[in-house]
Interface confidence: low
Amino acid sequence: EPPTACREKQYLINSQCCSLCQPGQKLVSDCTEFTETECLPCSESEFLDTWNRETRCHQHKYCDPNLGLQVQQKGTSETDTICTCEEGLHCTSESCESCVPHRSCLPGFGVKQIATGVSDTICEPCPVGFFSNVSSAFEKCRPWTSCETKDLVVQQAGTNKTDVVCGPQDRQR
């Protein structure tokens, strides 16, 4: 009686169970009544990551420097290449198919979280008492100068984009 189902790591073909090829190898020919499945290792630039009956290995992902990508982890016969972005860039998607420059936080905003290879800069508005007068991908909001600690008084109030201006106290005669 020919089988209708096969064991794990086998597949059914021509009414018989053949062994699947192990990760890192592709199928060259199915098994027969007399011969085992013939498998062949993937070439240097290819991979297969599961027990399979694929006749072609998958090409390793190309981390295209034209798109700002670089290799984070080189692929093996069993794993794909993992790409990341060059310094100053981050991925446009989870699969990291291309990169874009990190965003700068405009004046009035500070960096809440510095960008990484996979995430953009996160900016936050400078709260009262803090300011940022630069467009930067690194600078946090800075606190207004404390005039009192310098024995000075506030001559001009600070904003989210400007520091306070301190000046001497009016001395009454």
Epitope: P65, N66, G68, T81
Partner: antibody, heavy 120, light 112 residues
Framework: QVQLVESGGGVVQPGRSLRLSCAAS????????MHWVRQAPGKGLEWVAV????????YHADSVKGRFTISRDNSKITLYLQMNSLRTEDTAVYYC?????????????WGQGTLVTVSS | DIVMTQSPLSLTVTPGEPASISCRSS???????????LDWYLQKPGQSPQVLIS???NRASGVPDRFSGSGSGTDFTLKISRVEAEDVGVYYC?????????FGPGTKVDIR
């Protein structure tokens, strides 16, 4: 200034092998992808192969796949093209070229070329 | 593979006059980052090719501003605003969108 100097060309019989070299100077070789492009006598340009800066990725045109292999030695600042099972239709001037990177994808600086003649 | 075509294949121009070369690709060269992966090259007689335009419209370093590139997707144009004697040679477009990179057949430009 960027300089690329090819060598290794010559006359060779069909079925034989040849290895072309390209010596680079004037830029950080290990940071750039490199190409081979060829031009048959009186014909247009044909892209042959590209290799990434750290050698993890290489691609070849279908017309040379399985016969030609692009490689590089960053310590020697040299690009190579190993050509096996040569055919008469491989007769061409072979140029090595630097890849321009993110701002200028594709070959941006080219060598002067080396002539390969496959003839019996 | 992406197939590149050019027109015209031959062009004779008068010095000082403008010239225009068209290049078409069988697939879009516009990538998700907004750039068109098309380059223009000039091969002067007896010389190696030199890059004129990258990413469809970016003039390469040292290239005179009489050269300009335009277009998007599958249709591209190289324009020379005022042709000079030194502009003679064969002009090629090339797609760098995906491997294998492919060149157009070339456009031969002569001076009248």
């Amino acid at each position: 200034q960027v300089q690329l100097v090819e060598s290794g060309g010559g006359v060779v019989q069909p079925g034989r092998s040849l290895r072309l070299s390209c010596a680079a100077s004037g830029f950080t070789f290990s940071s750039y992808g490199m190409h081979w492009v060829r031009q048959a006598p009186g014909k247009g340009l044909e892209w042959v192969a590209v290799i990434s800066y750290e050698e993890s990725n290489r691609y070849h045109a279908d017309s040379v796949k399985g016969r030609f292999t692009i490689s590089r030695d960053n310590s020697k600042i040299t690009l190579y093209l190993q050509m096996n099972s040569l055919r008469t239709e491989d007769t061409a001037v072979y140029y090595c070229a630097r890849d321009g990177g993110i701002a200028a994808p594709g070959p941006d600086y080219w060598g002067q070329g080396t002539l390969v003649t496959v003839s019996s | 593979d992406i197939v590149m075509t050019q027109s015209p294949l031959s062009l004779t121009v008068t010095p000082g006059e403008p010239a225009s070369i068209s290049c078409r690709s069988s697939q879009s060269l516009l990538y998700s980052n907004g750039y068109n992966y098309l380059d223009w090259y000039l091969q002067k007689p007896g010389q190696s090719p030199q890059v004129l335009i990258s990413l469809g419209s970016n003039r390469a370093s040292g290239v005179p501003d009489r050269f300009s590139g335009s277009g998007s997707g599958t249709d591209f144009t190289l324009k020379i605003s005022r042709v000079e004697a030194e502009d003679v040679g064969v002009y090629y477009c090339m797609q760098a969108r995906q491997t294998p990179f492919t060149f157009g057949p070339g456009t031969k430009v002569d001076i009248r």
